[in-house]
Every structure is written in C-alpha cells, then in structure tokens.
Amino acid sequence: LEVQVPEDPVVALVGTDATLCCSFSPEPGFSLAQLNLIWQLTDTKQLVHSFAEGQDQGSAYANRTALFPDLLAQGNASLRLQRVRVADEGSFTCFVSIRDFGSAAVSLQVAAPYSKPSMTLEPNKDLRPGDTVTITCSSYQGYPEAEVFWQDGQGVPLTGNVTTSQMANEQGLFDVHSILRVVLGANGTYSCLVRNPVLQQDAHSSVTITPQRSPTGAVEVQVPEDPVVALVGTDATLRCSFSPEPGFSLAQLNLIWQLTDTKQLVHSFTEGRDQGSAYANRTALFPDLLAQGNASLRLQRVRVADEGSFTCFVSIRDFGSAAVSLQVAAPYSKPSMTLEPNKDLRPGDTVTITCSSYRGYPEAEVFWQDGQGVPLTGNVTTSQMANEQGLFDVHSVLRVVLGANGTYSCLVRNPVLQQDAHGSVTITGQPMTFPPEA
C-alpha cells in the first residue's frame, strides 16, 4: 500500500495549528471498517492518534490532535495538531493498513519569529570619541536559535568583539543577547540583524551614537525611538532608563508609567516602594535594576488592546519623561485555498479562488499573482474581520477565467512583522476536480 506524505518538513508557528498530510489510494469498494490508521512519533513509537474498527480512537497526544473524518474515505489520513509547541518538533509516522500495509514519516519543523531587537548602551552618557562602549542587542521569544549579524552605518560587517548568547525559556523559545564592544569614532551607526533561519525572517535595529556631553539640568529619560513590537500572548519590555547621580537612592525616586493619551495609571514606584500594577495585574518593574537607572516596564501576556503609547515619568530632584510606543503583532497562518466550482473544470470556466488566513494582527496586505509572478489585481475582493481578541481573519477572493492551465498564488503579509504567508493552487487544463482525487 502506497502512503504519501510531503518530502519537505511541515513548518508550523508556535501556537498555531499544523496539518501533517498523509494520503493513500483506496480501492473501489473500500469502507472505513477495513481501515487501521495509526499516527505515532517516529523515534519513540509513542502513539499520537489512531482510527480502527471503523471508529476514530481519539488523541493519545495531549488531546491536541484530530483526523479529518469526512475525508478518510477518500484516502486522506492527515493529522491536525493544534496549538503547536516547540516540544512537538520531530518526525511523525503515518501507518495505514487495509488489506496491505504501508507507512511514511513526515517531519514537523516548529518556528517562532523573533521580536524586533532592542538596543542598549553601556555606558550611555558622557560618551566621547575614543571611549569603549558595549552595545547589547536583545531579541526575544524566537525558535529555532537565531543567526546574529552586526554592521556599521555603511554596511561594513562587524565581526570582532561580538559575543552572542541564546537562552531557551520553559516553552523552548530562545531569547538572544548579542554584545558588541566598539571604540567610538566621531559618530557611528551600529546595526544588529537577528535572523530566524527557518522562517528566513529578519528583525533588525540600529543605534546611532554621537559622542557629546549630556546637558545638565532636567533628568534625561531615554526610551527606544522605534516602537516596541510584541507578539500577542508574549511578554513585552517597554524600555526606559535614566542616569542616576552618585549617591542616588531609591527613596528619592518617583517613577510613574501611564497611558500617554488617556493618562491612565499603569504602574508606579514611589516612597521607596513598588506600588504595583494598576493595569490588569499584567505589569512589573525590574526592582533589582532600578537603582542603576533602569525604569523599564514588563507587560505580560500582551493583547491587541495594549497597543499604543506609554509614558515613563521619572522624578528625582529634577523631572523628565519620554513616551515609548507598543506595536502589537500576531503572525498570519499559512493561507488555505479553496475553489468554487471545484470539479469538472475546463479552460474558459470562471472560477472563484478564495485565500483565507487567520488570527493575525495588524490588518494584512494581500497580493495575488500568477505562476510567472505577474500580479493579479483585477477582480480581487479582500475582507478582514476582527475577532473578540482583535485578531484579523483575512479572506481574499479572486475571480479568474481559466486558461489552458495556471498557477494562482496568494501572499498574505503582516506589515509589522514583515512576515509573508502564502498559498498557491495549480489548475491544469484538462477536466479536473479540486482538490485532486486520490
């Protein structure tokens, strides 16, 4: 019995659902009562899901798997794995037994995009040409391990004096910290690029240093110029720092975080004490770092509704403030493609191709093109609907008249993450049914 699975690994984003495709060719008169189907982990032989004696025997894998019962009789033995985790990565074997027996293994490659890097400088004040500074580039919650590249403001690679460390959290996601030590020139731009090698996703940030003395007087409060980009459900750090003078003590510090527009209190530190979160108990300071001038705020389990500007007010003797923007994002799922009509298609027929991608934020950009890369812009209707969490489901509909044959591809881009998800469908000229019957 020939069992077919994709040659290439199935790439799935952490937290999304993945389909491990597996198919066989049922003979005429085949009934599900004859079918024994087992999915198991290739290496450990752990049972994942099974179908036997005409019945779905259910998930043996954390209740996160499902078959496609309506499609089994057509030879579709694919497995749906929900809420993918890093620990799911590996090989899954699909065993099919009717009269004969066959099996094949499909690889699941798990991935998670890295956040836009944050850049910090040490020391961060009174910088002069000739000073040695340490620039730290930090990017969070990605998988698998990142590749990190540094360059100057004219594209020259900086490879000396770079130390990169990557630490996995409980979920197996990596936080990357890359440190560059440089001797300052008159001025300079230093940029750090963090690449996810599986998603081929680049996240980059840069810092321009103009050595000069800081002005005296008001407290200089420093925040990142660029918005902080955070994935829905992850934690975000809104960076804010000030330069404590010698002899500074926390008893002198008044620190207030509030929403810039509404002035709603988010978190505060006064009278030498952390006054706690006034924002759904999802915020925290870094108490051990406050005395060093680190007034950053940790926002947990980020939601779409958190997007916006947060102001960091610091008062010691003098007073200073700065606002940092939080940009929330969520990657779009790999688009699913449907055709209407989907059978007995002939050249000259008008078909409606629907491309659907789910649970992304912010709104997507959708591009259609044919098999030669020619953009298809006529007869396209795209709708985007937000769910209760504010995440968008995208449905883009293309109406085309079939030629002799043709490939139609749909690219769904998350403009913040610069994450592209695409699907395509190839329609051949002879009468056909979609999806092709096994």
Epitope: Q151, Q154, G155, V156, P157, H204
Partner: antibody
Framework: EVQLVQSGAEVKKPGSSVKVSCKAS????????IHWVRQAPGQGLEWIGY????????DYNQKFKDRTTLTADRSTSTAYMELSSLRSEDTAVYYC??????????????WGQGTTVTVSS | DIQLTQSPSFLSASVGDRVTITCRAS?????MNWYQQKPGKSPKPWIY???NLASGVPSRFSVSVSGTEHTLTISSLQPEDFATYYC?????????FGQGTKLEIK
Amino acid sequence: EVQLVQSGAEVKKPGSSVKVSCKASGYSFTSYTIHWVRQAPGQGLEWIGYINPNSRNTDYNQKFKDRTTLTADRSTSTAYMELSSLRSEDTAVYYCARYSGSTPYWYFDVWGQGTTVTVSS
Amino acid sequence: DIQLTQSPSFLSASVGDRVTITCRASSSVSYMNWYQQKPGKSPKPWIYATSNLASGVPSRFSVSVSGTEHTLTISSLQPEDFATYYCQQWSSNPLTFGQGTKLEIK
C-alpha cells in the same frame, strides 16, 4: 545621474606599480564606501578592498593587503587604487563600485566602466 | 572566509525554459546579492538583500532560500537573460563572490 568614471587602460612592466582613479559624481561622495573589484580574463569577480571616503578607513582582502593602497580625495570626489609589485597574473579589468543601500541591506548599485591593466614584459 | 559555490558553472538553455542557479554559502550569511554581467560590460545589480529585484529587473527572476543555499530562478528565459550571474556576500571579511554561472543559448 550617479556615475563612477575610471581612468584609462594601462600597460605595465612586471615589478612596477599602477594607480587607477575613480571619479564619483551625482551623489555625496562621503556617504558611501567605494570598493575595488578585479576580473582576470575569462575569470570571475574578486574583491580587493574598500575605502570609506568620510573616515578614510580601509580594509583589504588578505590576498592584496601587502601590495594595495586605497586612498580618497574628498575635494575632487575621487578614489584611487594603487597596486605595486605587479606580476603577469595581475592582468585584469579593475572596477570601482559604490556600496549602497540602507541598514541592514547593502549592495553594489553603481559600477565604474572598468580599467584594463595589462602586465607584460 | 565564507566561500560561495555556484552551480552549475555553465548552463545551456533555450528561450522559454525555466532555469535555476544555486549559490551555496559555506556558513550563514546576513543576506545575498546577485549581479548580471554581459561580455565586455560592467556587472549590474540584479537582486539585493536576498530576494529584492533591482530596478528594471523583470519579475520572472526570483530567489528562494533553504538554509545556506540560495536559488535564483528564471521562470521563462528571454533572449536578454543570457549572461553570467554572480552571487555576493559581505557578512564577514573578506567580501566574496561566487565563481559565476554562465547562461548560454542552447
């Protein structure tokens, strides 16, 4: 129009030196690095090194480090490549090119027309 | 040094063919650029930052990446596409080019 115009062809004796010029126009000369690349007859492209006209920082391919000097004259927006102790295998077309783009992606967007250097006794 | 190995070195094809040229890096690169060169002419920028087409480059050109392997695809060869193509990286010194792939008319 952004242009890099190189000096004319040179015929040199083994052991001598050659100095090739590359005059930039149509953009701020100090904003981009200028690189030198050579191509021997029927062969591929080989990087020699670059100069930052603003800081005058240079870096060289180790292969050429001992024999090559890159300089830049900001007053005339001209970059120079001098190659000494010439040998027959230095016979090649020498190109200057501007490394352009924006962080973090850069590429050679403008090339000179090339200068043919022939080393022959 | 990061070596870039292009394959094939020579490729004969006909107008209308779909062709692929591969550039394999000996280690990870921050991005890859591609240049087109015709006999007696200077190289021209063709693809930059791994997959972006330079100005005036037709959309039949595309690049895909798998690990350290970058593949340049021309979906339907046109007469003006016959030339030599070079890949280039500068993630670390020295800047390196692939040895080139010469695309000839069959």
